[in-house]
Interface confidence: medium
């Protein structure tokens, strides 16, 4: 309901005749329908890196030994079944939780075709009551399942091998002209069912197997390595309205929560009540001359609060996101009704303490005031609470609309999708992808450090057994000290008889330096948990220092930064393991080991077991890891 606020025509009661029943439009606008969807977007870069790191050119391996790819989209059945109400043949009640995921039964529906994806550049999966019944309940007499799945193996396999651009999958409520609010409720149920995309790429070994529709762990006799990805919303509780803001004028039910709960019953005092404007005029609630009141009263309904002494009442928004500095809370209140009370707005960010929002009043017509508070762009999803605190004996309060406006800038912020990756051992143990190919055996039989790692591009996984793995030095004169790949032949190093990258700093009359440069690595995926892992050792006395420099190729210019440094070291002659987070690397990069030493230095500097984590290229965190410096 608008009071001098341009919020458009609303269904209310005409000047004469019986009041019309407010009705929600039967079909949502294109923008609103889009906002009801859950979008999965797998970036093109993921496909490029998965192809480069895991899938060799087709000619290089026999069909039987080629990696295979599978995909599916899974939803929990319980929230979907709750939407449908009790259905015949459901063996566990819709209100109870689904069976534990580890042994969840699932029924698989056919996903989209490659042809569709190629034509439309995205796959739209519509989920309606029939699909829910087919996928979650099935034929009478069959056990209900806990998981509904769409098989996307053909599609994912094609995209990862031959596709171009990003993979976009949109899951949305089936379009149907049916009862009011159906699509909104179906969308909420879809969100509550925690939809997730599951991908799997595994190296095949002894035998080739038909791709089963479901995605259990393949058995050891036919896979050599097995990687799985799950893409899901970091914040599944976000309201679909988060995409385009929220505007509630109380003519229709809103996604707001009320404390104490909202009552439409006439005899409920001391809580929020939704009342039509006609009732308010009959009750003489709003001030102003009688004749004017009937003309100027906002049409439709608003919230009325009749409070006792010293009480607190709250309206709470759904979870929202904002991508715009201009995101604003706007609430229209009737100022003459609450001389003895006040409104406070609170921002409630996820995982952070609440904080008050500065409310700035703009007086409107006929006693109504619009309170506006800028919310801006919080890092995390948030809710907004409007509290009315009465401080007198009794007070009345009226709220005409509650809106969160201008919260999206350009493309919709939606929810942040995370692409979580894992490595499955032959015995079923699941590791984080970063644990694979790091020179530490985490699987019982060591398969996390085997075939897949050795096939990675040069420099990604290097123990110097086969030479320099892409590490190079500039042109060297015969007398220049140089890095070498050899074994540390010494009784004290019996535990480390394999090769390492070594530099001897002995017997130098003046100060010297030596640099060795790695192969070039591609730019990590934005906000990936990217790491460099390596072992290092300094034996003897180092009068100087050793640095590890990361050099980025930023638009043709090289920018170096030191990521590790050790100086003036009297070593324990022990191998030390280090893990360096590679944060904020946005371009292709390479590494340089730079050693500098002076007279009297008698040390051997050694590096070994250098690896770049696969997470850099095959994992996407839901939230950016780097904190923005916004004061």
């Amino acid at each position: 309901v608008g009071s001098g606020m341009g919020t458009g025509q609303r269904a209310g009661s005409p000047a004469a005749g019986p009041p019309l029943q407010p009705r929600e439009p039967l079909s949502y606008s294109r923008l609103q329908r889009k906002s009801l969807a859950v979008d999965f977007v797998v970036p093109s870069l993921f496909r490029v890196y998965a192809r480069d790191l895991l899938l060799p050119p087709s000619s290089s391996e026999l069909k039987a030994g080629r990696p295979e790819a599978r995909g599916s989209l899974a939803l929990d059945c319980a929230p979907l079944l709750r939407l449908l109400g009790p259905a015949p043949g459901v063996s566990w009640t819709a209100g109870s939780p689904a069976p534990a995921e580890a042994r969840t039964l699932s029924r698989v529906l056919k996903g989209g075709s490659v042809r569709k994806l190629r034509r439309a550049k995205q796959l739209v999966l519509e989920l309606g009551e029939e699909a829910i019944l087919e996928g979650c309940v099935g034929p009478p007499g069959e056990a209900a399942v806990g998981l509904l799945q769409f098989n996307l193996s053909e599609l994912f396999s094609w995209w990862i091998r031959q596709g171009e651009g990003r993979l976009r999958i949109r899951l949305m409520p089936e379009k149907k002209a049916s009862e009011v609010g159906r699509e909104g409720r179906l969308s909420a149920a879809i969100r509550a069912s925690q939809p997730r995309l599951l991908f799997q790429i595994f190296g095949t070994g002894h035998s080739s197997l038909e791709s089963p529709t479901n995605m259990p762990s393949p058995s050891p006799d036919y896979f050599t390595w097995n990687l799985t990805w799950i893409m899901k919303d970091s914040f599944p509780f976000l309201s679909h309205r988060s995409r385009y803001g929220l505007e509630c004028s109380f003519d229709f039910p809103c996604e707001l929560e009320y404390s104490p709960p909202l009552h439409d019953l006439r005899n409920q005092s001391w809580s929020w009540r939704r009342i039509p404007s006609e009732e308010a005029s009959q009750m003489d609630l709003l001030d102003g001359p009688g004749a004017e009141r009937s003309k100027e009263m906002p049409r439709g309904s608003f919230l009325l609060l009749n409070t006792s002494a010293d009480s607190k009442h709250t309206i709470l928004s759904p979870w929202m996101r904002s991508s715009s500095e201009h995101c604003t809370l706007a609430v229209s209140v009737h100022r003459h009704l609450q001389p003895s009370g006040r409104y406070i707005a609170q921002l409630l960010p996820h995982n952070e303490a609440a904080r008050e929002i500065l409310l700035m009043p703009t007086p409107g017509k006929h006693g109504w005031t619009v309170l506006q508070g800028r919310i801006g762009r919080p890092d995390n999803p948030f809710r907004v609470a409007l509290e009315y605190i009465s401080s007198g004996n009794r007070s009345l309060s009226a709220v005409d609309f509650f809106a969160l406006k201008n919260c999206s800038e350009g493309t919709s912020p939606g929810s942040k999708m995370a692409l979580q990756s894992s490595f499955t051992c032959w015995n079923g143990t699941v590791l984080q992808l970063g644990q694979a190919c790091d020179f530490h055996q985490d699987c019982a039989q060591g398969e996390d450090e085997s075939q897949m790692c050795r096939k990675l591009p040069v420099g990604f996984y290097c123990n110097f057994e086969d030479g320099f793995c892409g590490w190079t030095q500039g042109t060297l004169s015969p007398h220049t000290p140089q890095w070498q790949v050899r074994t540390l032949k010494d009784a004290r190093f019996q535990d480390h008889q394999d090769h390492a990258l070594l530099l001897s700093t002995t017997d130098v009359p003046a100060s010297e330096s030596a640099t060795v440069t790695s192969a070039t690595f591609p730019a990590p995926i934005k906000s990936s948990p990217c790491e460099l892992r390596m072992s290092w050792l300094i034996r003897g006395v180092l009068r100087g220092n050793v640095s590890l420099v990361l050099v980025e190729n930023k638009t043709g210019k090289e920018q170096g930064r030191m990521v590790w440094h050790v100086a003036a070291y009297e070593g324990l002659s022990l191998w030390q393991w280090m893990v360096l987070p590679l944060l904020d690397v946005s371009d292709r990069f390479w590494l340089q080991m730079v050693a500098w030493w002076g007279q009297g230095s008698r040390a051997i500097v050694a590096f070994d077991n250098i690896s770049i984590s696969l997470d850099c290229y095959l994992t996407i965190s839901g939230e950016d890891k780097i904190l923005q410096n916004t004061a």
Partner: antibody
């Protein structure tokens, strides 16, 4: 470079009014609220109020309601504070400071301050 | 209003010292605590926001910590240019309120 340039020192008679200005440069004026803070030896730093240059909306500390009037001119990227019915109590330094809406707990850049002397 | 009690009101230290200033709020302010530096010429700068986040351009010798109602600012290696008065400010509830200030002098 980002700057909040405040008007020069003022000497005014009791009972009169004065308008202090704060000219912003180096950023988009309408993207930040402008806040005003008073500093006295007795009370230290006190928040007076704020204006949202985009909408012209204002909010005040109850203590300064009626004493200070905040306005902003988008075209010149300048915020103003009018102080009315001046007394010797109003004779300290006044600062303008900007606040990002979400970094909303802190004032990230401050003006150099304007000294006000109320004396007959 | 939320009261902010800052201690000590003044302190003297030597160059290179580690200095800690405390700030106590009259209620839980949920980490919305900021620290400012005011130089003798009146210039005010933000040092730390949201308890521990360093504002851009602020040297890393400044650090902040705390939670609930108790907060502190630490200068780890005092330099001549750190001679100033330091203020805490809460941004959890309106109106924003400031501590009384700590005047830091060099021995």
């Amino acid at each position: 470079a980002l700057q909040l340039q405040q008007s020069g020192a003022e000497l005014v008679r009791p009972g009169a009014s004065v308008t202090l200005s704060c000219k912003a440069s180096g950023y988009t004026f309408t993207d930040y609220e402008m806040h005003w803070v008073k500093q006295t030896p007795v009370h230290g730093l006190e928040w007076i109020g704020a204006i949202d240059p985009e909408t012209g909306g204002t909010a005040y500390n109850q203590k300064f309601e009626g004493k200070a009037i905040l306005t902003a001119d988008k075209s010149s990227s300048t915020a103003y504070m009018e102080l009315r019915s001046l007394t010797s109590e109003d004779s300290p330094v006044y600062y303008c400071a900007r606040r990002r809406y979400y970094g909303s707990s802190s004032f990230d850049y401050w003006g150099q301050g304007t000294t006000l002397t109320v004396s007959s | 209003d939320v009261q902010m009690i800052q201690t000590p009101s003044s302190l003297s230290a030597s160059l290179g010292d580690r200095v800690t200033i405390s700030c106590r709020a009259s209620q839980d302010i949920g980490n919305y605590l900021n620290w400012y530096q005011q130089k003798p010429d009146g210039t005010v700068k933000l040092l730390i926001y949201y308890t521990s986040r360093l504002h851009s351009g602020v040297p890393s010798r400044f650090s902040g910590s705390g939670s609930g109602t108790e907060y502190s600012l630490t200068i780890s290696n005092l330099e001549q240019e750190d001679i100033a008065t330091y203020f805490c400010q809460q941004g959890s509830a309106l109106p924003p309120t400031f501590g009384g200030g700590t005047k830091l002098e060099i021995n």
